[in-house]
Amino acid sequence: LPAQVAFTPYAPEPGSTCRLREYYDQTAQMCCSKCSPGQHAKVFCTKTSDTVCDSCEDSTYTQLWNWVPECLSCGSRCSSDQVETQACTREQNRICTCRPGWYCALSKQEGCRLCAPLRKCRPGFGVARPGTETSDVVCKPCAPGTFSNTTSSTDICRPHQICNVVAIPGNASMDAVCTSTSPTRSMAPGAVHLPQPVSTRSQHTQPTPEPSTAPSTSFLLPMGPSPPAEGSTGD
């Protein structure tokens, strides 16, 4: 004969565990129902009554089956340098990612605490390493024979055009100027761009367990004067 299906709450057999989507309540010493994502335990179970679940209150969530007394608080609204890629719902936290042209300067357990603008390499410097969603652009001085005349977070150093007759020699921030009508070799017109990083990584705020008692923390980090990286500009 098949084993009889027990309905929550029930006392587990000695040495056995509660089933999927159930938990063992120490006070009642019974296996009781968990609450589904988007809910929390409003009333804990007893020996004779099962867990009473309730929907998460506004701006709070639970992502997993649970028996927490309060849903977790969603993270703060995304700041102006971020994009909300996932809204706060009863079942998921808000997810904010850095806007294009920004990167995550201060990450945390999951996601980003602080976005910062990607460094722009000034004329005479080109991008040595492009920015990613978690790292800044690295600039390098243009080597002899190359130049960059832009202030950009994507442009690399480009070779000077080679002239039959040089009118003005090129330098790190300017291309060579030729006197003859057509140079022997030149790069295609226009700056060479590196692709912008695309932010895809989840960056959501660490939840606080009890929105009704725990004030949210705002992360105000000192952004005072700091020496600019070589070849970079704050513009």
């Epitope: 719902t89 808000r94 009704s212």
Partner: antibody, heavy 120, light 108 residues
Framework: EVQLQESGPEIVKPGASVKLSCTAS????????MHWVKQRPEQGLEWIGR????????KHDPKFQDKATLSSDTSSNTAYLQFSSLTSEDTAVYYC?????????????WGQGTTVTVSS | DIQMTQSPAIMSASLGERVTMTCTAS???????LHWYQQKPGSSPKLWIY???NLPSGVPARFSGSGSGTSYSLTISSMEAEDAATYYC?????????FGGGTKLEIK
């Protein structure tokens, strides 16, 4: 364009009931709350209660629990506030207001208000 | 219930003057759950500052908000004629959600 359109002014007798409506248009987010707020002449704002139109769940300020009934009709995107056993204290402008889930209760859109006058 | 007390109840300021009004909660309120509304006579309230310090689009940058715990404030860096209105703070931290009594700002 997002709009909350409230029903017209009401003049009612003491002891009677009144049902106000608030029709929402232009919202693309279904996960919202509709709130009702009372403002007596020359006075401040008082939160009456709110309804989650998707589930019909309501929450009231206890002082309005027996006075106010909140309901909604999702097919017409309309929220209702029924006020019963009216007295002169209920003479006020009643506003409906919208807050999206996840915005910590910030009421970002308000109706134009419905004036209710209780007079014999 | 969390009581919200606004002060002053009425204030007047000259054009160009810096203005600060305060809102004190009877118990701690999370900064995410503290909002300000502006209301002019004959009009509906408008969300003016949300989650303590954030300005909705259309609100001039001369407005700012700050605070934590039980003490919050709204500041206008340089008063303009169109800022004359009543400002209400509102807590959504714990039900029943409550408004302050308002601060009426007039032009001197």
């Amino acid at each position: 364009e997002v709009q909350l359109q409230e029903s017209g002014p009401e003049i009612v007798k003491p002891g009677a009931s009144v049902k106000l409506s608030c029709t929402a248009s232009g919202f693309n987010n279904k996960d919202i709350y509709m709130h009702w707020v009372k403002q007596r002449p020359e006075q401040g704002l008082e939160w009456i209660g709110r309804i989650d139109p998707a589930t019909g769940n309501t929450k009231h300020d206890p002082k309005f629990q027996d006075k106010a009934t909140l309901s909604s009709d999702t097919s017409s995107n309309t929220a209702y506030l029924q006020f019963s056993s009216l007295t002169s204290e209920d003479t006020a402008v009643y506003y409906c207001a919208h807050s999206p889930y996840g915005d910590f209760g910030a009421m970002d859109y308000w109706g134009q208000g419905t004036t209710v006058t209780v007079s014999s | 219930d969390i009581q919200m007390t606004q002060s002053p109840a009425i204030m007047s300021a000259s054009l160009g003057e810096r203005v600060t009004m305060t809102c004190t909660a009877s118990s701690s309120v999370s900064s995410n759950y503290l909002h300000w509304y502006q209301q002019k006579p004959g009009s509906s309230p408008k969300l003016w500052i949300y989650s303590t310090s954030n300005l909705p689009s259309g609100v001039p940058a001369r407005f700012s908000g700050s605070g934590s715990g039980t003490s919050y404030s709204l500041t206008i860096s340089s008063m303009e004629a169109e800022d004359a209105a009543t400002y209400y703070c509102h807590q959504y931290h714990r039900s029943p959600w409550t408004f302050g009594g308002g601060t009426k700002l007039e032009i001197k």
